[in-house]
């Protein structure tokens, strides 16, 4: 990679004392001759993050490789991208800086993100000062994504970018709707073109295992090391204030790199110098924390102390980064104390060694408790270690105990003893439990009581119909939860088997016991609709109905009818037991009442999906019956009917109805209105001669009343063959009485 | 190209459900909020709900609060509206609209669906 | 809620003439209004975006202006093509609102 830093200057009181400074370790870099290739560039680049118009920045340079931007005259010259370009040739490398505003409402929690392709990327943009608006997110000042203000997350906003690919690549910004540009959270992704470890134009070249930080270049394979390491591996620390490629640059000032921001080019990105860290880079690493943003952790051994600039500082005779090799003596590497493998797997055990001599492949072996020495299959050596790979035959209960690896050299010896615990799958005990079941689906309660070793990491459920010689289908279920077994056949017996699984390889454990499990009958999908209605009384209604044509048979055993009450909040259900019924009569009704009425289909214990409403409205009950009617003959086609007004009326009586049949016919009643409720007395005109009549009446006021009792009359004569009664005035009458 | 194509509309009695479906191409349907809209006949543009592109906020007109659901399906790249307890007034074409702001912050309605019909009657 | 009143609801134009609709908001709705055109049968059409802001394809006979809570549409000469319903929509805040709509008719 070309040897370039952009190092920015964030003490930021006073922007005016801010300074970009850009250099270059390349040999000649920036002299501008066409002998040693173009000059160094910087300058800020307004393509995405525009800020207003200012003083023109002044560009200084110093000697042949540096280059020094000033002039900032207030804080919002500062926000944006800057970039240096350096290099020749196919080697002209850009390295960008992000500059956020520290008084912005969003801030990032990481300005510089370097993932792997194929990797998911998270921006978290922190909330310095809210608003209650849309917060926008853009990738290279091109709109992306949109989170509404209430999407934030214990004080941050997240962009999840799952699954990135080198053309990610790029500025984004978080932005509140209606706050200016400025206030933005800004961000660099950078994706490099392949896999963890990986570098080539097919990604097919392994990567030499960047130490301190260190990025692996996709393209070269080279590490690009944090500021202030050195080395093909950056396994060099430089010494502290120090930096470039071969620690050859110093950090100006008389407090080092505190306050510095140090970018390199891509993959690397930009982070603070060695042993500093913080949002402005001036906060000293904690102890135990060394390196570019403090992200190491020294864990020294053997007496070695932390250095926040190189990390573990050896005692004499003490080597390694945590001063944990002998400078003689070979030692067991990093061996846990526990390891942990399933009955009957064959694991692979490694064991890596170090010291001088350094140890090769015949001179690492394994124990086992009962004595028995593995020797190695493969060994893999590397600088600083080799690692010797054992494959176990089959496990069996007696392996468990303490095993030891041990290493011998001319140098002498070392061995560590390690506990092996060979665990048993876990084998169910009882059958599944249903908990639930409709027709396509059964709710079952996998966890049971099992022989063998926990934890349970994985439950899988097995189900097939009952008798079928077809494939089991298999769910694998989260260990504390139930689980629905969906898409079955209904009416349908399933066998259901259990098994479960302990972490690690082959710890999957046998099938429990099967258990039969029986899914409902199919619940009714036809949606009723009514067709009518009608009231046949104040407390009986007609109901008609009628369902969707569909072919094959009715999945149905009847329907079901309710009447919802809203005022006095009372359901009344009425049970058709005919699926082929249409209609039906309820009575019993409440006169005067608002009812919703609606219809479903039911098949055994499931209803079908209920027909819209209708609303229904039965007519008051009405009045008591007319008192003491009496009839009598006047002629042979007319006969003269008395009464009394009916007792304890709830209102004045609009009309009477008088019913009038033939004794013995098997014709309608005929009714006749008396549209004059004030009156005692009428005459029924138009009869037959010599013919008993049946007369009865009710009088209305909102709705029809009870019924009179029933008079019996004969009309007088034998006269002609009337048209038919008709009721007469009660003028007319009173000019017949007088 | 970009395409919005709304479905599911149709004939539906009083108090009963439909589901309406906007299919998406020709954008990141995934990174953009999605506006119901709808017009009764004769009448003028009603905003009836917005989701936000995680599917994890979203807000509705007054008129539809408690009956309508919006969802999506950012996998599928379809919007979705879920209409129960249906009335009469629901009566409408119901468009779909891609919401956006664009580097400026400026909002706009850019891409609209053809619409819908969905009849609410007895 | 903010509340959108637009005016007329309907007018009557030649071709050539000069015509300005107005949209009110019940309260400050900054600059966060667009305007639509609809033509009968189809879906509507964006014209102006943050009040004054021309979209992409639309002719330079359109403009907007205003901001806090009054707002205007004008079309500076009226085209055979422009007689339609145009419709004002705040975006400040939801629920998001449009106007009544104004119909613009041939005289």
């Known amino acids: 990679a070309v040897d370039l830093t952009l190092l920015a200057n964030l003490r930021l009181t006073d922007p005016q004392r801010f300074f970009l400074t850009c250099v270059s370790g390349e040999a000649g870099a920036g002299r501008g001759s066409d002998a040693w290739g173009p000059p160094l560039l910087l300058e800020k680049d307004d393509r995405i993050v525009r800020t207003p118009p200012g003083p023109p920045l002044r560009l200084a340079r110093n000697g042949s490789h540096q280059v020094t931007l000033r002039g900032f005259s207030k804080p919002s010259d500062l926000v944006g991208v800057f970039s240096c370009v350096g290099g020749a040739g196919a080697r002209r490398t850009r390295v960008i800086y992000v500059h956020n505003s520290p008084g912005a409402h969003l801030l990032p929690d990481k300005v510089t993100h370097t993932v792997n392709k194929g990797d998911t990327a998270v921006l978290s943009a922190r909330v310095h000062k809210e608003k209650q608006t849309d917060v926008i997110w853009k990738s290279n000042g091109s709109y992306f994504y949109t989170l509404d203000w209430h999407e934030a997350q214990d004080g941050r906003f997240l962009l999840q970018l799952p699954n990135v690919q080198p053309p990610s690549s790029g500025i984004y910004s978080a932005t509140y709707l209606e706050a200016s540009p400025l206030g933005s959270a800004f961000f660099r992704l950078i994706v490099r073109g392949c896999g963890a470890g990986r570098w080539g134009p097919g990604c097919t070249k392994e990567c030499p295992g960047c130490l301190h930080g260190g990025v692996c270049h996709d393209h070269d394979g080279e590490c690009v090391c944090p500021p202030g390491f050195t080395g093909t591996r950056c396994e060099q620390a430089c010494r502290e204030g120090r930096f470039g490629q071969s620690c050859q640059e110093q950090c100006p000032g008389i407090s080092g790199c505190r306050g510095l921001t140090f970018c390199l080019p891509d993959p690397y990105g930009c982070s603070c110098g060695s042993g500093w860290r913080g949002s402005q880079c001036q906060e000293a690493c904690a102890p135990g924390h060394f390196g570019a943003d403090c992200r190491l952790q020294c864990q020294c051994q053997n007496g070695g102390t932390c250095d926040r600039f190189s990390g573990c500082v050896c005692p004499s005779g003490w080597h390694g980064v945590h001063c944990e090799k002998s400078d003689r003596i070979p030692q067991i590497l990093n061996m846990a104390s526990e390891l942990e493998f399933n009955l009957e797997t064959m694991p692979r055990i490694n064991c890596a060694a170090a010291g001088n001599p350094f140890p090769v492949r015949g001179s690492i072996e394994l124990r086992k408790p009962d004595g028995t020495v593995l020797l190695s299959t493969k060994a893999i050596v590397e600088p600083e270690k080799t690692t010797a790979e054992f494959e176990v035959p089959r496990l069996v209960l007696a392996d468990s105990g303490f095993w030891e690896c041990r290493v011998s050299t001319s140098g002498g010896q070392d061995s560590r003893r390690f506990k092996v615990n060979v665990k048993v799958p876990p084998v169910p005990l009882a059958a599944p439990r249903l908990l639930t079941k409709q027709s396509r689906q059964l709710v079952v309660s996998p966890l049971v009581s099992f022989s063998g070793d926990g934890p349970i990491s994985t439950v899988r459920l097995h189900y097939r119909p009952q008798d079928s010689t077809m494939d089991w289908s298999t769910i694998v279920v989260d260990p504390s939860e139930n689980v629905t077994l969906m898409n079955l056949r209904p009416k349908t017996g399933y066998s259901v088997r259990v098994q479960l699984s302990r972490p690690g390889e082959g710890g999957e454990g046998a099938w429990g016991p099967p258990t039969l499990m029986t899914t409902d009958c199919p619940e009714p999908l036809l949606q009723p609709w009514l067709e009518g209605w009608h009231v046949e009384g104040t407390d009986r209604l007609r109901v008609s109905w009628s369902l969707p044509l569909v072919p094959g048979p009715l999945v149905g055993d009847g329907f079901l009818l309710r009447l919802w009450d809203g005022t006095r909040g009372q359901e009344r259900r009425e049970n058709v037991s005919s699926p082929q019924a249409r209609t039906a009569l309820l009575t019993g009704l409440t006169p005067g009442t608002h009812y919703q009425l609606d219809v479903q289909l039911y098949h055994c214990t499931l209803l079908g999906p209920a027909s819209p409403p209708a609303h229904v409205l039965l007519p008051p009950s009405g009045p008591p019956a007319p008192r003491h009617l009496h009839a009598q003959a006047l002629s042979d086609s007319e006969i003269q009917l008395t009464w009394k007004h009916p007792e304890a009326l709830p209102g004045p009586i609009s009309k009477y109805v008088v019913e009038v049949q033939v004794a013995g016919g098997a014709g309608d009643p005929l009714w006749i209105d008396v549209d004059r409720p004030e009156e005692t007395s009428t005459i029924i005109r138009g009869l037959n001669a010599s013919t008993r009549y049946l007369f009865r009446m009710r009088a209305s006021i909102q709705g029809l009343g009870d019924w009179s009792n029933t008079v019996e009359e004969s009309t007088l004569g034998n006269g002609l063959q009337a048209e038919g009664p008709v009721q007469e005035s009660r003028a007319a009458e009173e000019g017949l009485d007088q | 190209e970009v395409q919005l194509l709304e479905s599911g509309g149709g004939l539906v009695q009083p108090g009963g459900s439909l589901r309406l479906s906007c299919a998406a191409s020709?954008?990141?349907?995934?990174?953009?909020?999605m506006n119901w809209v709808r017009q009764a006949p004769g009448k003028g543009l009603e905003w009836v709900s917005v989701?936000?592109?995680?599917?994890?906020?979203?807000y509705y007109a007054d008129s539809v609060k408690g009956r309508f659901t919006i969802s999506r399906d950012n996998s599928k790249n379809t919007l979705y509206l879920q209409m129960n307890s249906l009335r009469a007034e629901d009566t409408a074409v119901y468009y779909c609209a891609s919401g956006y702001y664009d580097s400026s912050g400026y909002s706009r309605f850019d891409y609209w669906g053809q619409g819908t019909l969905v009849t609410v009657s007895s | 809620d903010i509340q959108m009143t637009q005016s007329p609801s309907s007018l009557s134009a030649s071709v050539g003439d000069r015509v300005t609709i107005t949209c009110q908001a019940s309260?400050?709705?900054?600059?966060?209004l667009n305007w639509y055109q609809q033509k009968p049968g189809k879906a509507p059409k964006l014209l102006i975006y943050?009040?004054?802001n021309l979209e992409t394809g639309v002719p330079s006979r359109f403009s907007g202006s205003g901001s806090g809570t009054d707002f205007t549409l004008t079309i500076s000469s009226l085209q055979p093509e422009d007689f339609a319903t145009y419709y004002c929509?705040?975006?400040?805040?939801?629920?998001?609102?449009f106007g009544q709509g104004t119909k613009v008719e041939v005289k």
């Open positions: 309260q400050d709705i900054s600059n966060y």
């Open positions: 989701i936000y592109p995680s599917g994890g906020w979203t």
């Open positions: 929509l705040q975006y400040k805040s939801y629920p998001r609102l």
């Open positions: 020709g954008f990141t349907f995934s990174n953009y909020k």
């Open positions: 943050h009040a004054s």
